[in-house]
Interface confidence: low
C-alpha cells in the first residue's frame, strides 16, 4: 500500500494510473467504500463523502490514463485509505495528514518559551525534528519545547515529520521580540548633547504598547522615572517627562531619546522597558552614561569621570604631544601646577580612547580656557 503524507491546510494529489492511455471510467472511494468522485464520460461526478466540496480531479490528465484525486485544505481527519477503482483494478493509497502549530503567538518575547505541537492521525507514531534559524536541532514526539528564546531564534524554523520512512516538512516563522542590544554605554564630555537609541530587532506591521525609562544616577540614592511614553502603530507619544532632565523623545521608531546636555548628576544607568499590547512580560534595554569633566582650579588641573566605568579603564592627563603626566585606574586624576598648553584628559580601554576632553592652561597670570 502506498503511503502519502500531507500537511494540514495544504493540497494533496493522490495518483491513480490506468494501463490504457485514454479516458475510461474510474472511481475514488474511502475506506468505508463511500464514493468520493469519479467520471461519467467527460463529466466529473461526486459522491456523498465529507470531502465533497474539497475534492477534485484533473480532467486534462484523463486522456493520458491518469485519474488523480485532489484534496484541498487538508484536515487531520482526512487521514484515511483511499481506493481508486479503474479497469477492474483497485489501487490503495494511505493518506496521513499532520499539522504543526506554535502553542501561542509566533511573536514571543526574548526569554520566553516556544512550544510546537504536532497534530497527527490516530494510530500514527511520527517523530519530529526541528532546526532553528541558528542551526540548533531539537527532537521530540507530539510536543517540542524550547525555553529561553534568544534573538538568534528569530526566523524560519524548519521541522521534519517522519512516518513510515516518508517525511513532510513544516516551516514556521518565529519572531523574537527584543531590542537589538541588551546593553549600551554612552561616553560624553560635560555639556554635550546625549543621544540614546533603542533600536528594535524586529519589524511588525502594527506596534502598540507603552514604555518607561528608569534612571539610577550614580549620585542619587534611588532611581527615578525620567520618561513614560505610549507607542501606537509605531508612533511615539510621551505621557510624562521629568522637568530635570528635560528629555526629548523621537516621535518615530527607532525609540530615540535626547538629553540636552551631559552633566555629572545625570551619569549613571538606565533601564528602558517596553510593554507590548497583548504580550505578557516586557522588553528591556540597559543604557549607561559616563560623563567627563576637566577643570582647573587655582594650581590644580583635575579630570573626573562619573558613571558606570569598568575597573580596567584608564584615566589620564597629558600635555598635547607629550607622555601622560598621570595615568590611573581611578575616576579622578589631577596635576598640580600644570604647565601652560593644551591638556588632554583621556578615558581609555586597552589603549583605545573612549572619551577625550581638552582644556587649555594659560600662563599663571591668566585663567584657563575650555575649548
Amino acid at each position: 500500500k502506498k503511503v502519502v503524507l500531507g500537511k494540514k491546510g495544504d493540497t494533496v494529489e493522490l495518483t491513480c494510473t490506468a494501463s490504457q492511455k485514454k479516458s475510461i471510467q474510474f472511481h475514488w472511494k474511502n475506506s468505508n467504500q463511500i464514493k468520493i468522485l469519479g467520471n461519467q464520460g467527460s463529466f466529473l461526478t461526486k459522491g456523498p463523502s465529507k470531502l465533497n466540496d474539497r475534492a477534485d480531479s484533473r480532467r486534462s490528465l484523463w486522456d493520458q490514463g491518469n485519474f488523480p484525486l485532489i484534496i484541498k485544505n487538508l484536515k487531520i481527519e482526512d487521514s484515511d485509505t483511499y481506493i481508486c477503482e479503474v479497469e477492474d483494478q483497485k489501487e490503495e493509497v494511505q493518506l496521513l495528514v499532520f499539522g504543526l502549530t506554535a502553542n501561542s503567538d509566533t511573536h514571543l518575547l526574548q526569554g520566553q518559551s516556544l512550544t510546537l505541537t504536532l497534530e497527527s492521525p490516530p494510530g500514527s507514531s511520527p517523530s519530529v525534528q526541528c532546526r532553528s534559524p541558528r542551526g540548533k536541532n531539537i527532537q521530540g514526539g507530539k510536543t517540542l519545547s524550547v525555553s529561553q528564546l534568544e534573538l538568534q531564534d528569530s526566523g524560519t524554523w524548519t521541522c521534519t515529520v517522519l512516518q513510515n520512512q516518508k517525511k513532510v516538512e513544516f516551516k514556521i516563522d518565529i519572531v523574537v521580540l527584543a531590542f537589538q542590544k541588551a546593553s549600551s554605554i554612552v561616553y560624553k564630555k560635560e555639556g554635550e548633547q546625549v543621544e540614546f537609541s533603542f533600536p528594535l530587532a524586529f519589524t511588525v506591521e502594527k506596534l502598540t504598547g507603552s514604555g518607561e525609562l528608569w534612571w539610577q544616577a550614580e549620585r542619587a540614592s534611588s532611581s527615578k522615572s525620567w520618561i513614560t511614553f505610549d507607542l501606537k502603530n509605531k508612533e511615539v507619544s510621551v505621557k510624562r517627562v521629568t522637568q530635570d532632565p528635560k528629555l526629548q523623545m523621537g516621535k518615530k521608531l527607532p525609540l530615540h531619546l535626547t538629553l540636552p546636555q551631559a552633566l555629572p548628576q545625570y551619569a549613571g544607568s538606565g533601564n528602558l522597558t517596553l510593554a507590548l499590547e497583548a504580550k505578557t512580560g516586557k522588553l528591556h534595554q540597559e543604557v549607561n552614561l559616563v560623563v567627563m569633566r576637566a577643570t582647573q582650579l587655582q594650581k590644580n588641573l583635575t579630570c573626573e569621570v562619573w558613571g558606570p566605568t569598568s575597573p580596567k579603564l584608564m584615566l589620564s592627563l597629558k600635555l598635547e604631544n607629550k607622555e601622560a603626566k598621570v595615568s590611573k585606574r581611578e575616576k579622578a586624576v589631577w596635576v598640580l601646577n600644570p604647565e601652560a598648553g593644551m591638556w588632554q584628559c583621556l578615558l581609555s580601554d586597552s589603549g583605545q580612547v573612549l572619551l577625550e576632553s581638552n582644556i587649555k592652561v594659560l600662563p599663571t597670570w591668566s585663567t584657563p580656557v575650555q575649548p
Epitope: 507619544s237 528635560k246 526629548q248 516621535k251 518615530k252 530615540h256
Partner: antibody, heavy 120, light 107 residues
C-alpha cells in the same frame, strides 16, 4: 548648500490630476522624513502629508486622504505628491519641507513652493 | 485632532518694540511646538523649535517659551526685517497643525 526645489505645479481642471516633484540636494535625503505643506491664496499654512525615510510610513491630513499620495525615490533624492480628483479648494502654493528628526523639531528646510491652480 | 489657537491674528508695532505672540493647544503637547516666520511670496522659515530652542542662524532677539498647552514667541526689540506673518506649528501627533497666523505690521 541644503536645498529643496519643487516643480510640477500648474493649472488643472476640477477632477484632474497633477504630480508635484521636489528635488533635494546638500543633505542625506534618505535620512529624513519629508513633508508637503500648502498655502491657499491669502490663507495660512496647512500641513498636507509626510513620509518616513524609507517610504514605509505615510500620513495625510483628512481632507486629502484617498486623493493624494506621497512617495519618494531615495536613489534620485526626490519627493513626490500625486494629486488626483483635484478640487477648487486644493488651489494653493505647495511647499516641500524637511521634517525635523524629533517631535517639536518642526520643519527646518523648505523649498520655494510651486503653484497649483484648480479651475474650470 | 488637537486644535491650535494663535493670537492675536494681527498686530501693529514699531521698530524697537517688544512683542509677544501666543499659541494655545487644546490639550497638553509637552514642548513639541515650533515657530515660523513667513514673508510675502517666500517660504516659511523656522525660528524656534521644541518651544524654546533657537534655530541656528536666527537672531537672539527671538525667543520662545512654554510647555503643555500655552506657548509664546517674543521678539525683544523689533527690527525692520521682522515685519512678517508668524505661525506656530504643533508636530506632537498627526495631523500636524499650524496656528492661524499672526500678521505683524509696522505701526
Amino acid at each position: 548648500e541644503v536645498q529643496l526645489v519643487e516643480s510640477g505645479g500648474g493649472l488643472v481642471q476640477p477632477g484632474g490630476s497633477l504630480r508635484l516633484s521636489c528635488a533635494a540636494s546638500g543633505f542625506t535625503f534618505s535620512s529624513y522624513w519629508m513633508s508637503w505643506v500648502r498655502q491657499a491664496p491669502g490663507k495660512g499654512l496647512e500641513w498636507v502629508a509626510n513620509i518616513k525615510e524609507d517610504g514605509s510610513e505615510k500620513y495625510y491630513v483628512d481632507s486629502v486622504k484617498g486623493r493624494f499620495t506621497i512617495s519618494r525615490d531615495n536613489a534620485k533624492n526626490s519627493l513626490y505628491l500625486q494629486m488626483n480628483s483635484l478640487r477648487a479648494e486644493d488651489t494653493a502654493v505647495y511647499y516641500c519641507a524637511r521634517d525635523g528628526s524629533y517631535s517639536g523639531y518642526g520643519m527646518d528646510v523648505w523649498g520655494q513652493g510651486t503653484t497649483v491652480t484648480v479651475s474650470s | 485632532a488637537i486644535q491650535m489657537t494663535q493670537s492675536p491674528s494681527s498686530l501693529s508695532a514699531s521698530v524697537g518694540d517688544r512683542v509677544t505672540i501666543t499659541c494655545r493647544a487644546s490639550q497638553g503637547i509637552r514642548n513639541d511646538l515650533g515657530w515660523y516666520q513667513q514673508k510675502p511670496g517666500k517660504a516659511p522659515k523656522l525660528l524656534i523649535y521644541a518651544a524654546s530652542s533657537l534655530q541656528s542662524g536666527v537672531p537672539s532677539r527671538f525667543s520662545g517659551r512654554g510647555s503643555g498647552t500655552d506657548f509664546a514667541l517674543t521678539i525683544s526689540s523689533l527690527q525692520p526685517e521682522d515685519f512678517a506673518t508668524y505661525y506656530c506649528l504643533l508636530d506632537y501627533n498627526y495631523p500636524y497643525t499650524f496656528g492661524q497666523g499672526t500678521r505683524l505690521e509696522i505701526k
